[in-house]
């Protein structure tokens, strides 16, 4: 199962970390992939580790774990942000985050 | 025992296209990501493309992305590297290689196949 | 792109000494790194992955440490097999990069 915050909120020119908690005792994540709206952030595979989208690369950091920290934070970032995990052999797992951003 | 075999190497103009294959054996394929490397002429190594067990991510280095496809056929044992558009600067010793699993570090190359562009 | 500095370039040892090869990255990049050995005319062989995780087979006079930005490769007692081209590379970031090599040379 996915847990997550499903809201979060955070100020303009600030940053906040996307997180998506996956547990299970059997499936092993193989790949995470993380979305604003349909937009994609970036991609982690255990395989060929992280993949910033080129349109995030200045304000997206891996981590902490399989998150993501968010930078320099403005209006237009507030929305659904999306994770996907992908696991074997426990199929696909998705959560969802709504964050708000506030003007400082 | 574990063993990867390139080949396709050649040499083509400018311009031109060439495909790359890399056989796999002693080791289970479809189970492993599988990586390009090369390394030009008296230079070092320069890692060029990489696709996952079933291909659903791939990585491309900067000086290839939009002239090289890499693929791989898991019933084959297989893997490709579609080189379009090639430059002078192409010009390698292709490597195919196998990761450990899970960890990243390269621990079985092939003996390479070399490609030279040049008119 | 993560860049991956070596240095030196290249180093001039004899048999017993104690060499050290570092390589930084232009961004962190936790602990996924490893160390090649490059032979004339063979194909690299991996000695480290991880960092600091010895592969199979490779001697005990090998060994790495490091994390984020800075990681080193250390050579205890250079033995005669040792003189060749050792490369860093990173595995955090796609595009993986390796770093420029460092020639350790005999004296």
């Known amino acids: 199962t996915i847990d997550t915050k499903r809201n979060i909120s955070a100020e303009e020119g600030g940053s906040v970390i996307l997180q998506c908690h996956f547990s299970s005792d059997t499936a092993e994540v193989t790949q995470v992939d993380w979305k604003q709206q349909d937009q994609l952030l970036a991609i982690y595979s255990v395989d060929l580790g992280w993949h910033v989208a080129s349109v995030f690369s200045d304000r997206v950091v891996p981590g902490p774990s399989l998150g993501l920290t968010f930078q320099s934070l403005t209006m237009n970032d507030t929305g659904e942000y999306f994770c996907t995990y992908h696991t074997y052999p426990g199929g696909i797992y998705k959560g969802r985050i709504f964050l708000k951003v506030q003007e400082s | 025992q574990v063993q990867l075999v390139e080949s396709g190497g050649g040499l083509v103009q400018p311009g031109r296209s060439l495909r790359l294959s890399c056989a796999a054996s002693?080791?289970?394929?479809?189970?492993?990501?599988m990586h390009w490397v090369r390394q030009a002429p008296g230079k070092g190594l320069e890692w060029v493309s990489g696709i996952t067990w079933n291909s659903g991510l791939i990585g491309y280095a900067d000086s290839v992305k939009g002239r090289f496809t890499i693929s791989r056929d898991n019933a084959k044992n297989s893997l490709y590297l579609q080189m379009n558009s090639l430059r002078a600067e192409d010009t390698a010793l292709y490597y195919c290689?196998?990761?450990?699993?899970?960890?990243?570090?390269?621990?079985?190359w092939g003996q390479g196949t070399m490609v030279t562009v040049s008119s | 792109d993560i860049q991956l500095t070596q240095s030196p370039s290249s180093v001039s040892a004899s048999v017993g000494d104690r060499v050290t090869i570092t390589c930084r990255a232009s961004?962190?990049?936790?602990?996924?790194l490893a160390w090649y050995q490059q032979k004339p005319g063979k194909a690299p062989k991996l000695l480290i992955y991880g960092a600091s995780s010895l592969q199979s087979g490779v001697p005990s006079r090998f060994s790495g440490s490091g994390s984020g930005t800075d990681f080193t490769l250390t050579i205890s007692s250079l033995q005669p097999e040792d003189f060749a081209t050792y490369y860093c590379?990173?595995?955090?970031?796609?595009?993986?990069?390796f770093g420029g090599g460092t020639k350790v040379e005999i004296k």
């Open positions: 002693g080791f289970t394929f479809r189970d492993y990501a």
């Open positions: 590379q990173q595995a955090f970031y796609l595009p993986w990069t």
């Open positions: 961004q962190g990049i936790s602990s996924w």
């Open positions: 290689a196998k990761p450990v699993p899970r960890l990243r570090g390269l621990d079985v």
